[in-house]
């Protein structure tokens, strides 16, 4: 079974890698622009050149290309607490990045929000924090995880996951109430 | 089957609050980020608040930050949203959705909330 292919891709698949067929007339073969420029004009015939123009500035094409624009430079989203790890220029796309002990969480597949690594206070770091993904603690006895902070067993509810981690912690509490001296 | 299925909406008189409730089923809960999103009469959708698995992940809009506060039980496969402080503008159709690469990819029926005087 051959693979679908797209119009473009079928157009592109008959010339050579790094050239196009030109819209107009298919027995032309045009070079593509390189990153960092984009298609002005197609080349008006065999062996003749392109015309291609660097991007302007806040747009850019990564890779060798035949579009007729360049494409907008992202911006990294604050509201995210996104930083700039670099700039856009006219081959790369801005990179956004988190500051230092953050990691990202993804919402989708392209929207990650910042947040703080996990310190694991009242516990110990079983897994560093990562770039994608924030700090596995292990708590300390008469402690239990929630949301990936080490709470104290005291402030564990019979209705809460808690009781299983915590259970020892409980009846110990029982024990030592239900022993009075007599 | 995925289900979500929203309550807790109303009406509400400005400067008061409510607390939407969303029943999942269908899917394992605790593995997914859950959002709230909403639609005003003659509006698009808007994203209002998100909430990773754990429920240590929070977003807000900024339009609600300060006076909604979204949570979970994963014991209870239920995610919430307290609204406090609610105006005339939160005025919307709310939807609870299933988290996924392309934001969500499930959501409820939803439930109405009428802020009015």
């Known amino acids: 079974l051959v693979p679908h292919l797209g119009d473009r891709e079928k157009r592109d698949s008959v010339c050579p890698q790094g050239k196009y067929i030109h819209p107009q007339n298919n027995s032309i073969c045009c070079t593509k622009c390189h990153k960092g420029t984009y298609l002005y004009n197609d080349c008006p015939g065999p062996g003749q050149d392109t015309d291609c123009r660097e991007c302007e500035s806040g747009s850019f094409t990564a890779s060798e290309n035949h579009l007729r624009h360049c494409l907008s430079c992202s911006k990294c989203r604050k509201e995210m607490g996104q930083v700039e790890i670099s700039s856009c220029t006219v081959d790369r796309d801005t990179v956004c990045g988190c500051r230092k002990n953050q990691y990202r969480h993804y919402w989708s597949e392209n929207l990650f929000q910042c947040f703080n690594c996990s310190l694991c206070l009242n516990g110990t770091v079983h897994l560093s924090c990562q770039e994608k993904q924030n700090t596995v603690c292990t708590c300390h006895a008469g402690f239990f995880l929630r949301e990936n902070e080490c709470v104290s067993c005291s402030n564990c509810k019979k209705s809460l996951e808690c009781t299983k981690l915590c259970l020892p912690q409980i009846e110990n509490v029982k024990g030592t109430e239900d022993s009075g001296t007599t | 089957e995925v289900q979500l299925l929203e309550s807790g909406g109303g009406l509400v008189q400005p400067g008061g609050s409510l607390r939407l409730s969303c029943a999942a089923s269908?899917?394992?809960?605790?593995?997914?980020?859950m959002l709230w999103v909403r639609q005003a009469p003659g509006k698009g959708l808007e994203w209002v608040s998100g909430?990773?698995?754990?429920?240590?992940?929070?977003y807000y809009a900024d339009s609600v930050k300060g006076r909604f506060t979204i949570s979970r039980d994963n014991s209870k496969n239920t995610l919430y949203l307290q609204m406090n402080s609610l105006r005339a503008e939160d005025t919307a159709v709310y939807y609870c959705?299933?988290?996924?690469?392309?934001?969500?990819?499930?959501w409820g029926q939803g439930t109405l909330v009428t802020v009015s005087s």
């Open positions: 959705a299933k988290g996924s690469i392309t934001l969500f990819d499930y």
């Open positions: 269908g899917f394992t809960f605790e593995e997914y980020n």
């Open positions: 909430i990773g698995p754990s429920g240590r992940e929070t």
